[in-house]
């Protein structure tokens, strides 16, 4: 087995990221073949972590193509019958070592997932999986622990009747001590350790054992079948077994002799010289979550899964939290409904991603009668007299800028300000000088003119104030009515949208 950069992926990169020595571990996880989200469900069939891991230290310019890997086997014990079809998850983990790494640090380098078919008792099946820039070569097989036997590791054990001990002549099952060995159905004397049977009165040998009762290791076997006894020192003359002796075809393949050699006819889902390789095709449905399987028409060609929205991974086994990408703009609320993404928009925004700014001024942006002015993709408030700030929420002193001309006195008022003009001047800001003898007012002239009739002046001021107040009230009324209409329109739309969302969530 090997783990490293895939072919044609540029300079092989180190798994240690130039941060000192590291070690690689493998976590193997087995799940039932129907598991729909392979990385999210439990490892129901079993899980194991590799041991005896050599330390890898990166040297400048050194190729990472051949990394020292955990030696020996990763054994995943499974308690129940072997299902034949299963999901295999292999995770490659890096443990960063050394002080400058800040103590041991674990990182998941790669995860491969795939549905597999494998009968127990067969030879090693080889596989190659790519994920990102990494490539993992590995072999796997399933073996039954006695007394379980056959392609499905069926138990030839039954539940014990008495809690304390097994019946006469029967012993506890291993590895199932809570059960007792079943009454013998195999050929009497058939080795319980190295032989098994699927039919009564037969004795089939596990790998490495032979003889009528499976008691003879293959290496020291006495001369069997057509093998001719030889001199005592040599034990046997071995002209070679018949090509189909012992059935070299694994996984239920049938052997036929062809010109001194053999040929295996493999059952569906297996291929290779001895039917030892488990091939998954698109017809096996290897892609989870409705993913589209492309390629893989035959077991020799690799398949690729094209995932539905919201899923990723080599077999579409991982759910993506699409809301983490913050797809809803302008403060919209994101709801991932599985195969649909919904954004609930704030007032004033619409569209699948809340990208449409319906009306910058929709959300009562300007307070205290201020008017919202759009422009250049942004909004600003033109505030009513007496108010200021971004949203017109701050009280302003209207007299601070000394708005009354010609010595007029400024008084702050609920609608803004009022100027009490000095003798000889009139107007909202005391900008007009008053002509003698009731002539029309003119813009301010040099001083020395006669003072106007105070009563007429006061009437002018009141008239101006009334006009201003009426204008402001009318403006507010128009603004409130138009806003109410707009809000009613979007409340309807939002109620409809929430109804749709509720339906989808219920679905």
């Amino acid at each position: 087995h090997s783990f490293g950069p895939g072919p044609g992926l540029g300079t092989p990169r180190s798994p240690c990221n130039a941060r000192g020595p590291c070690r690689l571990f493998f976590r193997v996880c087995l799940k039932p073949g129907v598991s729909q989200e392979a990385t999210e469900s439990l490892c129901a069939l079993g899980a194991a972590l590799s041991t005896s891991v050599p330390v890898y230290t990166e040297h400048p310019g050194e190729s990472a193509a051949a990394l020292p890997l955990p030696d020996g086997l990763v054994r995943v014990p499974f308690r129940d019958a072997w299902p034949g079809t299963f999901s295999l998850v292999i995770e490659t983990w890096r443990e960063q070592l050394g002080e400058h790494a800040g103590g041991p640090a674990w990182n998941l380098l790669a995860r491969v997932v795939g549905r597999r078919r494998l009968a127990a008792g067969g030879p090693w099946a080889r596989d190659v999986q790519r994920t990102g820039t990494w490539e993992l070569h590995f072999s796997y097989r399933a073996r039954c622990e006695p007394p379980a036997v056959g392609a499905a590791c069926a138990r030839l054990c039954r539940s014990r009747s008495a809690p304390s001990r097994c019946g006469p002549g029967l012993r506890p099952c291993t590895p199932f001590p809570d059960e007792c060995e079943a009454p013998s159905v195999c050929r009497p004397g058939c080795s319980p350790e190295h032989g098994y049977c699927e039919e009564p009165d037969e004795c089939r040998c596990l790998e490495g054992w032979t003889g009528p009762l499976c008691t003879v290791p293959v290496s020291t076997s006495s001369c069997l079948n057509s093998r001719v006894p030889g001199p005592a020192s040599t034990g046997c003359l071995l002209p070679g077994p018949g090509p189909c002796d012992g059935n070299p075809c694994a996984n239920g393949g049938s052997c036929s002799e062809t010109s001194g050699s053999f040929e295996c006819a493999c059952p569906r889902g297996f291929y290779g010289l001895r039917c030892e390789v488990s091939g998954v095709t698109c017809a096996d449905g290897p892609c989870f979550n409705g993913g589209l399987c492309v390629g893989g028409e035959d077991p020799d060609s690799a398949y690729v899964c094209h995932c539905p929205p919201g899923f990723q991974g080599s077999n579409c086994e991982k759910r993506v939290d699409r809301c983490s990408l913050q797809p809803c703009q302008n403060g919209g609320l994101c709801l991932d409904l599985g195969h649909a993404l919904r954004c609930r928009c704030r007032a004033g925004f619409a569209g699948p991603r809340c990208e449409h700014d319906l009306d910058d001024c929709a959300g009562r942006a300007c307070a205290n009668g201020g008017t919202c002015v759009e422009g250049g993709g942004s909004r600003r408030c033109s505030c009513a007299l007496g108010f200021g700030g971004r949203d017109c929420r701050e009280r302003a002193d209207p007299c601070a800028s000394r708005p009354c001309a010609h010595g007029g006195r400024c008084y702050a008022h609920f609608s803004g300000l009022v100027c009490a003009c000095a003798p000889g001047y009139m107007g909202v800001r005391c900008e007009f000088a008053v002509r003698p003898d009731g002539a029309d007012a003119v813009p301010a002239a040099p001083r020395g003119l006669r003072q106007a009739d105070p009563q007429r002046f006061l009437a002018g001021v009141i008239a101006v104030i009334v006009v201003v107040v009426i204008a402001i009230v009318a403006g507010i009324v128009v603004l409130v009515i138009s806003r109410k209409k707009r809000m009613a329109k979007y409340e309807k739309a939002e109620i409809k949208e929430m109804g749709e969302m509720h339906r989808e969530l219920n679905a």
Partner: antibody
Framework: EVQLVESGGGLVKPGGSLRLSCAAS????????MNWVRQAPGKGLEWVGQ??????????HYAESVKGRFTISREDSKNTVYLQMNSLKTEDTAVYYC????????WGQGTTVTVSS | NIQMTQSPSSLSASVGDRVTITCKAS??????VSWYQQKPGKSPKLLIY???NRYTGVPSRFSGSGSGTDFTLTISSLQPEDFATYYC?????????FGGGTKVEIK
């Protein structure tokens, strides 16, 4: 070779019922989402509904136009998916196809349903 | 539901012609668009998935392009067996929806 074969179509009166079947071969049926898609005469394609896997509790989804009237079920042991159609309307007249997956990769040959008085 | 608008609804072309069919989505569907071919009396067949990827066994004269809301199916050199109706479908948002179809006829 992958094959999906629909059956059960025919002529039915408005308000009547019909049960369509789709038998699959050449695929590991239990690993596939199954859909029904229909096509009214001279019209385009319309997705009708979907059933997912045993591990997903055989979850079903339906188009708004058939919700409450149509029911999809499956029998993995028989490699078959069903479409039970109740309260049929004239607008349900169409050729009904069964398809696999999310992207409708494999299709059956279709079965014709005619709703007419 | 997302609407898919296909154009033209029909077109006449000769063998060897370059044919382009367009499909417009009512909202952004990324690249989750597939194209299907349907011959009279037959079931649809998947041609293109993911907007631009040819499905297994589909000839190289078929190509797809586009993303977001505008998509195109192109047949670089029309062959006699290509006369059929073509449908686009979006798979971005559930439920999947299809365009009205484009019938490619012999001129």
């Amino acid at each position: 070779e992958v094959q999906l074969v629909e059956s059960g179509g025919g002529l039915v009166k408005p308000g009547g019922s019909l049960r369509l079947s789709c038998a699959a071969s050449g695929i590991t049926f239990s690993n596939f989402w199954m859909n029904w898609v229909r096509q009214a005469p001279g019209k385009g394609l319309e997705w009708v509904g979907q059933i997912r896997l045993k591990s997903e509790d055989y979850a079903t989804h339906y188009a708004e136009s058939v919700k409450g009237r149509f029911t999809i079920s499956r029998e993995d042991s028989k490699n078959t998916v069903y479409l039970q159609m109740n309260s049929l309307k004239t607008e349900d007249t169409a050729v009904y196809y069964c398809t696999t997956g999310y992207y409708f990769d494999y299709w059956g040959q279709g079965t014709t349903v005619t709703v007419s008085s | 539901n997302i609407q898919m608008t296909q154009s033209p609804s029909s077109l006449s072309a000769s063998v060897g012609d370059r044919v382009t069919i367009t499909c417009k989505a009512s909202e952004n569907v990324g690249t989750y668009v597939s194209w299907y071919q349907q011959k009279p009396g037959k079931s649809p067949k998947l041609l293109i998935y993911g907007a631009s990827n040819r499905y297994t066994g589909v000839p190289s004269r078929f190509s797809g392009s586009g993303s977001g809301t505008d998509f195109t199916l192109t047949i670089s050199s029309l062959q006699p067996e290509d006369f059929a109706t073509y449908y686009c479908g979006q798979f971005y948002s559930f439920p999947s929806t299809f365009g009205g179809g484009t019938k490619v006829e012999i001129k």
